[in-house]
């Protein structure tokens, strides 16, 4: 079986992850993507993914999950902002290509988040604050992956609208240089 | 539109093993979702078995892991179920339905069939 | 493993009138990051499989008349029939699905 290796991303509450996913331009670039989480004993769950076909460079946000698809580089960009504890665990960016099984990039992302201010003065992290504009997305970012996607008869109230809206702000606060480790299984 | 259909005997004596089949029609299996089998004794609630994806990828409910397997024939467009060494406890409507792993629910559902555990 | 509670175990309501069901989950089925709750809601007639009707907690099954609503997040959600009609006499449960897939005891809805 082959080993599966991961990258050890430690953060802060409050920080960002930001990861780049590296694929096979020529292969996968308008392929739908998809970043979801691996729990132990269970199949991944997806929590974000581009649309169907991906459209470069067009942010889909998802929560707190930002999706971005750069075709010209063969990179899918993903960033999680506003990290809390609870979101430690072990990540990956798949591409979907049904009938296929979901294609993994990348090695898995091996989030852990731990409590405490990363901007303290005399801290060695680089702490800089952004403010990303967020397009609207034309669609609602599903997943479904399939030949046949759903129809949605009802949006879920604002408070957990999956898209941003127009000229929607999202502040990445504390966005640092990240220490990479991998881990072998 | 997706149908299924569930398929097997009726009847199953203790300690044997439960074996039943689900046709898939109106969707090829291989083209996504996962296919699931969900259980309810006569009167009582639901109970999730385990999923399976066309790639043969199984997951579980850990309580039962021990005893079932689910396995899938692409070419047939069926997967089926087995649960060994079964009890009383085993009687149950059995369902199979596709499980959208992204949505995170079972839709649509097979009609259900009967398995009594008797000697 | 995630324990879904339904409460009450049975309603009778009469025509028009609202039916509310409660499901409390033993831990959380919100995935914060992407701000969805794992959690659906099914109607199961008598003699019959059950029926999706609610997926992320209130998102609606395509099909479903809206008088079918879903609300709450974490780990209390509610089920609301705003006008109760006759073919809605059924067994309702909730499911999980942050960590493998549970289902609630199921609600009883009759007609007063």
């Known amino acids: 079986a082959t080993k599966l290796t991961e990258e050890k991303y430690e953060l802060k509450e409050g920080q960002t992850l930001d990861v780049k996913c590296d694929y096979t331009l020529e292969k996968f670039a308008s392929s739908q993507k998809a970043w979801q989480i691996i729990r132990d004993g269970e199949m991944p769950k997806t929590l974000a993914c581009t649309e169907r076909p991906s459209k470069n460079s067009h942010p889909v946000q998802v929560g707190r999950i930002i999706l971005e698809d750069y075709h010209d580089h063969g990179l899918l960009r993903v960033r999680m902002v506003n990290l809390q504890v609870e979101d430690s665990g072990l990540y990956q960016c798949v591409i979907y290509q049904p009938p296929k099984e979901p294609h993994m990039l990348f090695d898995r992302i091996r989030l852990v988040v731990t409590k405490g201010f990363s901007g303290t003065p005399g801290s060695n992290e680089n702490s800089t604050q952004n403010v990303y504009k967020i397009p609207p997305t034309t669609t609602k970012a599903l997943c479904p992956l399939y030949t046949s996607p759903r129809t949605v008869t009802q949006a879920p109230p604002k408070s957990t609208a999956d898209v941003s809206t127009p000229d929607s702000e999202i502040n990445l606060t504390n966005v640092t240089d990240i220490i990479r480790v991998p881990v072998f299984n | 539109q997706v149908q299924l259909q569930e398929s097997g005997p009726g009847l199953v004596k203790p300690s044997e093993t439960l074996s039943l089949t689900c046709a898939v029609s109106?969707?090829?299996?291989?083209?996504?979702?996962?296919w699931g089998w969900i259980r309810q004794p006569p009167g009582k609630g639901l109970e999730w078995i385990g999923s399976?994806?066309?790639?043969?990828?199984?997951y579980y409910n850990p309580s039962l892991k021990s005893r079932v397997t689910i396995s899938v024939d692409t070419s047939k467009n069926q997967f089926s179920l087995k649960l060994s060494s079964v009890t009383a406890a085993d009687t149950a409507v059995y369902y199979c339905?596709?499980?959208?792993?992204?949505?995170?629910?079972?839709?649509?559902w097979g009609q259900g069939t009967l398995v009594t555990v008797s000697s | 493993d995630i324990v879904m509670t339904q409460s009450p175990d049975s309603l009778a309501v009469s025509l028009g009138e609202r039916a509310t069901i409660n499901c409390k989950s033993s831990?959380?089925?919100?995935?914060?990051?992407?701000?969805?709750?794992?959690l659906a809601w099914y109607q199961q007639k008598p003699g019959q499989p059950p029926k999706l009707l609610i997926y992320?907690?209130?998102t609606r099954e395509s099909g479903v008349p809206d008088r079918f609503s879903g609300s709450g997040s974490g780990t209390d959600f509610t089920l609301t029939i705003s006008s109760l009609q006759a073919e809605d006499v059924a067994v309702y449960y909730c499911?999980?699905?942050?960590?493998?897939?549970?289902f609630g005891g199921g609600t009883k809805v009759e007609i007063k």
């Open positions: 339905a596709r499980h959208d792993d992204y949505l995170s629910s079972f839709d649509p």
């Open positions: 109106g969707y090829s299996i291989s083209s996504g979702y996962y």
């Open positions: 399976i994806y066309h790639s043969g990828s199984t």
């Open positions: 831990q959380s089925v919100l995935y914060s990051s992407n701000n969805k709750n794992y």
């Open positions: 992320w907690a209130s």
């Open positions: 499911q999980q699905d942050h960590s493998f897939i549970t």
